[in-house]
């Protein structure tokens, strides 16, 4: 806390300049009034304070609107804005989108923050929706913002959001998020025709379920092994020893190299050994010939 | 318009002293923060010191400290720079620029120092 | 003291895009937003190119754009012209002196 000390003759703040980096901590508390801040705060940023004297000019809107600061503050933060506590941006109504991206812009090439990821629940939580221009705007400032959302949150992306999304912002998602924004994809981009719906398509599959997987065989995808990777386990291991060969197309010869790791390991044990040797490629794992499939799971099912 | 015009050229002998001016047009002087920075010949920029003319007091660079002495005239928008003790590796050009984040500049003053 | 680094020399053909760094610690470059660019050509005054780390002036052309990443700046230059061929410097406010630090220089070279 600063002392309440009387403003120097001749040192009373007219306006916000520079001349205020040659201020001690007590004289900014004393010689520059809140309001004026308040209405020049687009100016604080191209003045080099230091962080203890940003504490000072923090202290001084903090007196002045105990409430919560007004939109018009908020958006010339700047700077500043690095001194906010998450308990201080639950007070702000954030509406503007441009309001957002000047605060996101601060922490640009930084981690997102404790006050960054409370900034963004405050600002979505108003909209009461993730819209498309805010999605765009989060994605941008960081790319795996949608992966770091729970799948409840994910829920309220309306589909045509997803066309903001680029393959680089689910690289962090896990399956149980896939599985919520696969169906928004597969609505959002169902009227494109075949190879330009797999193209967008793609990047959401990991939620896709095994009769979706089965038609895109049908379709000459060509679907990549990092791709095939990612699919969910549960819905691979109903596909033929055909379908996948479909899928992936010139991209079979990859199973080879990933017949230990799931889901291809799991698949090769669901199918006939000579099935799996009409790919030519050494498949081993396979139910042997001449065996007898339970599907013990079905059994379960009908008791 | 934003105008720094600064003084003409000079030659000096080392061990003297040089005083150049900039003079500010079209905006406010007083309480803007005007640098001197200073390119040797073929070198990078060198930052020298600084005024904010209604203060008067002025801050230096820790290798001119003692050396330059920075003014300013608020009645006339004039920033001065002295350089004293002049030596041969003093030879620059000699640039005043307004604002911490230098958006104006002057046009530069050559200060040849030879014996 | 502070100190900025910056590459000697960088070079580009006519349409491309360069990106010059500008290195210093987290007390300056990483710790503030107040690292700026400026433009010098061969017998002229330095001009301000970027502020605030990626601010415009105004009459600064869209082609130039600021960033940083944890202790470096970077100035992109796209569609790359030849009046661009200049010396770039990185400079930030140094609060210790209370005064200004510049980088070494990046000479661009347009092929």
């Known amino acids: 806390e600063v002392e309440k000390t009387a403003c120097p003759s001749g040192k009373k703040a007219r306006e916000i300049d520079e001349s205020l980096i040659f201020y001690k901590k007590w004289e900014l508390e004393a010689c520059v009034d809140a309001a004026l801040l308040a209405t020049q705060m687009d100016r604080v940023n191209a003045i080099p304070f230091t962080y203890e004297q940003l504490d000072v000019l923090k202290h001084k809107l903090d007196e002045l609107y105990p409430q919560g600061y007004p939109e018009s503050v908020i958006q010339h933060l700047g700077y500043l804005f690095l001194k906010m506590s998450p308990e201080d941006i639950r007070k702000w109504n954030v509406t503007s989108l441009e309001t957002l991206k000047a605060l996101l812009e601060v922490n640009k090439g930084h981690e997102m923050s404790p006050q960054v990821a409370t900034l963004i629940d405050r600002f979505v939580k108003g909209r009461g929706q993730l819209d498309k221009d805010t999605l765009d705007t989060l994605t941008a400032f960081y790319p795996g913002y949608l992966c770091s959302l729970s799948p409840e949150e994910l829920s309220s992306v309306p589909p045509s959001s997803i066309w903001a999304v680029r393959p680089q912002d689910l690289d962090t998602c896990d399956p149980r998020q896939l599985d919520v924004l696969y169906p928004k994809a597969r609505l959002a981009f169902q009227n494109m025709n075949g190879s330009e719906y797999f193209v967008k398509i793609q990047s959401f599959l990991g939620g896709a379920p095994t009769e979706d997987l089965k038609a895109l065989s049908q379709q000459n995808v060509s679907m990549d092994l990092a791709t095939f990777m990612k699919l969910r386990t549960d819905a691979v291991l109903p596909l033929t020893v055909a379908e996948v060969q479909k899928l992936l197309g010139p991209h079979v010869e990859g199973l080879k190299a990933e017949e230990r790791h799931r889901p291809v390991r799991d698949w090769i044990l669901r199918q006939r050994q000579d099935d799996l040797d009409t790919l030519g490629l050494g498949l081993q794992g396979g139910i042997p010939n001449g065996y007898l499939v339970l599907d013990l799971s079905m059994q379960e099912a009908l008791s | 318009q934003v105008q720094l015009v600064q003084s003409g050229a000079e030659v000096k002998k080392p061990g003297s002293s040089v005083k150049v001016s900039c003079k500010a047009s079209?905006?406010?002087?007083?309480?803007?923060?005007f640098s001197w920075v200073r390119q040797a010949p073929g070198q990078g920029l060198e930052w020298m010191g600084g005024i904010i003319p209604k203060f008067g007091s002025a801050n230096y660079a820790q290798k001119f400290q003692g050396r330059v002495t920075i003014t300013a005239d608020e009645s006339t928008s004039t920033a001065y720079m002295e350089l004293s003790s002049l030596r041969s590796e003093d030879t620059a050009v000699y640039y005043c620029?307004?604002?911490?984040?230098?958006?104006?500049w002057g046009q530069g003053t050559l200060v040849t120092v030879s014996s | 003291d502070i100190a900025l680094t910056q590459p000697a020399s960088v070079s580009g053909s006519p349409g491309q895009s360069i990106t010059i760094s500008c290195t210093g610690t987290?007390?300056?470059?990483?710790?503030?937003?107040?690292v700026s660019w400026y433009q010098q050509h061969p017998g002229k005054a330095p001009k301000l190119m970027i502020y605030?780390?990626?601010k415009r002036p105004s009459g600064v052309s869209n082609r130039f754009s600021g960033s940083k990443s944890g202790n470096t700046a970077s100035l992109t230059i796209s569609g790359l012209q030849a009046e661009d061929e200049a010396d770039y410097y990185c400079?930030?406010?140094?609060?210790?002196?209370?005064?200004?630090?510049f980088g070494g220089g990046t000479k661009l070279t347009v092929l």
């Open positions: 400079a930030t406010w140094d609060h210790s002196q209370m005064g200004k630090v």
């Open positions: 620029a307004r604002r911490t984040s230098m958006d104006y």
């Open positions: 605030s780390v990626s």
């Open positions: 987290s007390s300056d470059v990483g710790g503030y937003n107040y």
């Open positions: 079209g905006g406010t002087f007083s309480s803007y923060y």
